[in-house]
Interface confidence: medium
């Protein structure tokens, strides 16, 4: 054993050595290497990249690196029968067709296997009909259409702009409204920042650029054919009719040049207000159908994509812990991309690669982490978080007993303005302390800490002098670890200024123009933001794997529980009469939160005072910290969402990307005034308050003295 292994002390210089070993130039080199050809899930190119990463991680010094394969449902366009949308005249002649592919970016004209824009898992179909413009296709947009404007989408093809919410929620909402097809498009209002040129001259979306993406509503299920279990060699697969989360109507994405041609002819109702207008020179009429001169013309979709069971490959690397090898800290990010993956995911994968290299360098010098670190390169994230979910399903018994933390590592940048962190409250103090030790890469903050620039640019809404940290939602590979298994999770990346740039995500997201050059020319020429993200992600992993006492502060959970209880109570108090009529009380929840606060405070005091040289007591206290997140898991899951089991957080039912607090109560209260049976609806609210109060109380008791 090395001297570090023989003692329980991790010298501070090891963290410094780890961070100092991370190099921007390496991240740049890795990003270039990962982005020269497409790495679509299920393709030979992505299998070859998996093997390359396996080989390099072994060279870097990991103890073992294995491929874990699964056979999952994926979706591809038909190579000989392309997808498109037409405007047809009364004779059925196609008088306009949308483009079949994006014009390739300079230098990539001869690259083969660029998958054309498509909505993954769309069923086949050729619906034709009148168009209805549904804004962002959010729940509230359909409420506005159906309830206020009395516009019926049944039997119509709807056109929705991308942005605000996950595209799968848009499709689900359209289905529920009775639509027979969905056209998704990128409006310049959301994907073209003023004053910036289109790619290749800037980072804006050109008119021919299109966002790909899956349109599933999996609710955490993983492979649609094997929910709850790994898609292994002896898996029992559901029939396609019983598959989880597949859309039932054809869906297709287009760019704003093609959208202009469809929207400029729209007639019917005017947009209800300015929030329904984008930036195209069209009236943004809602429809249904085209205006006067064009009223006999219809829209027709031609969708021929196929769903196929296909093999995918995760790469799993292990760096065995010296003291607690049965405690796992996981760093994972995906490898598969829609096309080149310049930002998503390879800006993240390049950072993971450099973190592995740095850890490997320390290991070659005789160092080991206290706990085991697992590194993962996930496959098929873009098709519904499939690689991570299947692996977690296969290893769930190990993970629920041994999983300390999961740090996600998708795109390292979505802008270059400031840090963005979403994580469990248990990690707030870890993130604060770490960022105080790191240098800010921001202009104007030379010699200042990352914490300072972050706090200045993204202040907490509640706590003066602290940065904003957001709730975890979903739409990325932490989902199964946090929402299903209850493993403390976090993610970090550099982001844009959300105050000044209200466009959704980054403009070139999931388009062919997401290239190495996009990053190197426009986002991060010096790769200093990538390096900072590597330091944050790597630093979190280092501390989680190496701290003698786990760097979790349970008091921060107490603070947010009170905030979330206040919030959900205030939502319920919009209905004071019904609360009185049905005897709805939040007393049990507030009481449980109070108990949690007191017990967490006492636990924290004991944590300061206990004898850290006693390995049994140390392990006991660390286990209480590790299992606290697990204590918020309800084995029965949320109503109709069995794989979302965390009682405090779940992806919003209206937007998979966003996190909702006390989601069971929130969903029970949502639109309750429209429920046909108020007694039943308020009964469900009461049941959800009971579940939440019990869970918070039960979690609190896991922090009590054990005997």
């Amino acid at each position: 054993k090395s001297s570090n292994e023989a003692t329980n002390i991790t010298p501070k210089h090891n963290m410094k050595a780890f961070l100092d070993e991370l190099k921007a130039e390496n991240i740049k080199k890795f990003l270039y290497n990962f982005t020269q050809i497409p790495h679509l899930a299920g393709t030979e190119q992505n299998f070859q990249l998996a093997k390359q990463i396996q080989s390099q991680w072994k060279e870097f010094g990991l103890d073992s690196v294995e491929l874990a394969h699964y056979d999952v449902l994926l979706s591809y366009p038909n190579k000989t029968h392309p997808n498109y949308i037409s405007i047809i005249n009364e004779d059925g002649n196609e008088i306009f067709n949308t483009s079949l592919f994006e014009p390739p970016p300079p230098g990539y004209e001869n690259v083969s296997d660029i998958v054309p824009p498509f909505s993954a898992f769309s069923p086949q179909g050729m619906p034709e009909g009148d168009l209805v413009y549904v804004n962002y296709a959010r729940t509230e947009d359909f409420f506005k259409l159906e309830r206020d404007m009395k516009i019926n989408c049944s039997g119509k093809i709807v056109i929705a702009r991308y942005g605000k919410v996950f595209r799968g929620n848009k499709v689900k909402n359209a289905q529920l409204a009775g639509a027979k097809g969905v056209i998704l498009y990128s409006d310049p209002a959301d994907y073209f920042a003023p004053g910036v040129k289109s790619y290749p001259d800037g980072w804006n979306l050109p008119g021919g650029g299109v966002q790909r993406g899956n349109i599933l509503n999996l609710n955490g299920a993983g492979d649609p054919l094997t929910p709850g279990y790994p898609a292994n060699e002896y898996a029992y697969r559901r029939g396609i009719a019983e598959a989880v989360g597949l859309p039932s109507i054809p869906v297709h994405p287009i760019g704003y040049y093609d959208a202009q041609k469809l929207l400029e002819k729209m007639g019917g109702s005017a947009p209800p207000d300015s929030s329904w207008r984008g930036s195209l020179k069209v009236p943004y009429n809602v429809g249904p159908g085209f205006t006067g001169n064009f009223s006999t013309q219809k829209v027709k979709m031609h969708i021929h994509s196929t769903n196929e069971v296909t093999r995918i490959y995760n790469v799993i690397g292990t760096l065995r812990g010296a003291v607690e090898p049965d405690r796992y800290v996981i760093l994972g990010g995906h490898r598969d991309s829609w096309v080149f993956g310049g930002i998503d995911p390879q800006s993240g994968a390049a950072v993971v690669h450099e973190i592995v290299r740095s850890f490997g360098t320390l290991k070659k010098e005789g160092w080991r982490p206290r706990r085991t670190i697992l590194f993962a390169s996930w496959d098929a994230e873009e098709f519904g978080l499939l690689g991570s979910t299947e692996w977690a399903e296969e290893n769930s018994r190990l993970l629920q007993e041994r999983g300390v933390a999961y740090i996600n590592a998708d795109s390292s940048i979505e802008g270059n303005y400031t840090l963005r962190v979403d994580c469990t409250p248990l990690m707030y103090s870890l993130v604060h302390n770490l960022t105080k030790e790191l240098k800010s890469p921001d202009e104007g903050f030379e010699g200042k800490s990352l914490y300072e620039s972050w706090t200045k640019k993204s202040p907490s809404p509640e706590f003066s002098g602290m940065p904003r940290i957001s709730k975890l939602g979903s739409g990325n590979d932490f989902e199964v670890f946090f929402q299903r298994l209850g493993i403390a999770s976090g993610r970090a990346r550099y982001t844009k200024n959300w105050e000044t740039n209200k466009f959704s995500g980054y403009p070139l997201y999931h388009s062919v123009y997401e290239t190495y050059e996009l990053v190197e020319k426009f986002y991060d020429p010096m790769f200093k933001y990538h390096l900072t993200v590597a330091q944050v992600r790597g630093g979190m992993v280092f501390e989680l794997a190496n701290s003698i006492v786990l760097p979790f502060d349970c008091r921060d959970y107490a603070v947010v529980l009170r905030k979330y209880a206040d919030k959900i109570y205030s939502i319920s108090m919009k209905h004071p009469q019904e609360m009185k009529t049905y005897s709805v009380s939040f007393d049990s929840l507030f009481s449980a939160v109070k108990n949690f606060t007191e017990i967490a405070s006492k636990f924290s005091e004991r944590l300061q005072d206990f004898d850290k040289s006693n390995p049994i007591v140390l392990r006991m206290m660390n286990d209480q910290l590790m299992f606290l997140e697990r204590a918020f898991i309800d084995p029965l899951g949320l109503p109709d969402r069995p794989f979302y089991r965390h009682v405090i957080y779940a992806p919003s039912s209206h937007n998979k990307y966003a996190g909702e607090s006390f989601p069971g109560i929130y969903d029970a209260l949502f639109d309750i005034e429209s429920k046909v049976d108020p007694s039943k609806a308020w009964g469900e609210v009461k049941r959800q308050i009971y579940v939440a109060a019990f869970t918070v109380q039960a979690a609190a008791e896991t922090l009590s003295e054990v005997a």
């Epitope: 809404p461 982001t495 959300w498 105050e499 959704s504 919030k567 205030s570 966003a658 996190g659």
Partner: nanobody, 119 residues
Amino acid sequence: QVQLQESGPGLVKPSQTLSLTCTVSGGSISNSGYYWSWVRQHPGKGLEWIGFIYYNGSIHYNPSLKSRVTISVDTSKNQFSLKMSSVTAADTAVYYCARDGDDYGDYLRGQGTLVTVSS
């Protein structure tokens, strides 16, 4: 659906106090996890954050404007207000009120109102 509308005088004399009000419709200002902010955009420049008030009453200001700015809320009218004292020509800008939330991307802005500081 929540909408925000700014109102107030379009012309303010130098050294006087600028007063703007934001009326929120389609949702209550007080009973959710949102916070309500003021931002401004000088002609031909980017947006500048002025400050925000959280639903629980806590207020944060841009340090460079802190000494001149007051943000307040009137929950009974579903409005929040901005007062900026000792204005100069440099305060000429389009002023926006905005809503944000716990989550990134939960951003919603009013149409904006041009305020000119001139004698």
